[in-house]
Interface confidence: medium
């Protein structure tokens, strides 16, 4: 059955982030009320035109490649960029649009038969055999500056919290990072015991809102170290 009859708050369609933080595998993440549970099989977020974060070319569309948006930019921040057309500069094959490849730093036509095998290999490297669906991709133009400056709404794909609208932060949700609500008083939060542990979460929570801090819930003081529940509390 398709459990997609939802009200307008699009984040409710996201896969339920239960088990959320690495430090609290048993506690529910209150991203939004009414989140769907497995049984139905489709969940969809709101449409958005935020820069799409990526770690490698295969995570982008067929007409895109993964790179830092600025020349010599932060290597840790990469997004899907529109592919380079023929005669444009390139550093690797993936930068060139379909039907082209990178030769001596320039995108050239790959009409030559000897290159076909390499293109096929790149396509099948993607998860799923895309041969049947490649035709379904429409041509995409480069990102306009408007796309970069639109603040993401709840559920929008993001790179960092500054990409999100007020009251939202950028946090991981399964594989991607999306805009989620900043936590309110009383909501469960994640207290990171060691530096860098935030990156281990598959479903990250936002941080606590202004005037709040993430502390052990009073009635959980007696609980064992691993099961202590943290909530957003007034300073």
């Amino acid at each position: 059955t398709l459990n997609s009859v939802l009200n307008s708050n699009a984040i409710k369609n996201l896969p339920p982030p239960l088990g959320g933080a690495a430090g609290h595998p048993g506690s529910a993440v209150s991203a939004a009320p009414g989140i769907l549970y497995p049984g139905g099989n489709k969940y969809q977020t709101i449409d958005n035109y935020q820069p799409y974060p990526c770690a490698e070319d295969e995570e982008c569309g067929t007409d895109e490649y993964c790179a830092s948006p600025t020349r010599g930019g932060d290597a840790g921040v990469q997004i899907c960029l529109a592919c380079r057309k023929r005669r444009k500069r390139c550093m690797r094959h993936a930068m060139c649009c379909p039907g082209n490849y990178c030769k001596n730093g320039i995108c050239v036509s790959s009409d030559q038969n000897h290159f076909r095998g390499e293109i096929e290999e790149t396509i099948t490297e993607s998860f799923g055999n895309d041969h049947s669906t490649l035709d379904g991709y429409s041509r995409r133009t480069t990102l306009s500056s408007k796309m970069y400056h639109t603040k993401g709404q709840e559920g929008s794909v993001c790179l960092r919290s500054s990409d999100c609208a007020s009251g939202l932060c950028c946090a991981r949700h399964f594989w991607s990072k999306i805009c989620k609500p900043v936590l309110k008083e009383g909501q469960v939060c994640t207290k990171h015991r060691r530096k860098g542990s935030h990156g281990l979460e598959i479903f990250q929570r936002c941080y606590c809102g202004e005037g709040l801090s993430c502390r052990i819930q009073k009635d959980h003081h007696q609980a064992s170290n691993s099961s202590r529940l943290h909530t957003c509390q007034r300073h």
Partner: nanobody
């Protein structure tokens, strides 16, 4: 319509192994990642493992690291979860999930699809 069908669940003794499969059909978009989640009786559902589309990047829950291995067969649109050194606490319904781009652009809405689950029971 996209369908994810899990198989490979069953009864196994502690210390034993099982291999779960998740076959995807009706795909008209490109996956970004596939993963496994599980829900034990009376407990919240939890993340187990995930693999990105190219298969080069994987993530695991701390509780299964070193015991479970996620992999994917591109040609069959199938993801696998090899579960070794199983413990009674691994008993749960295991769900397959997929995160995908829209069919025309990765900036389209992200789409999430779920399977119906397969039961894994670890008991002597």
């Amino acid at each position: 319509e996209v369908q994810l069908v899990e198989s490979g669940g069953g009864l196994v003794q502690p210390g034993g192994s099982l291999r779960l499969s998740c076959a995807a059909s009706g795909i008209t978009f490109r996956f970004k990642a596939m993963g496994w989640f599980r829900q034990a009786p009376g407990k919240e559902r939890e993340f187990v493992a995930a693999i990105n589309r190219s298969g080069r990047s994987t993530r695991y829950a701390d509780s299964v690291k070193g015991r479970f291995t996620i992999s994917a067969d591109n040609s069959k649109n199938t993801a696998y979860l090899q579960m070794n050194s199983l413990k009674p606490e691994d008993t749960a319904v295991y769900y397959c999930a997929a995160e995908s781009h829209g069919s025309t652009s990765p900036r389209n809405p992200l789409q999430y699809d779920w399977g119906q689950g397969t039961l894994v029971t670890v008991s002597s």
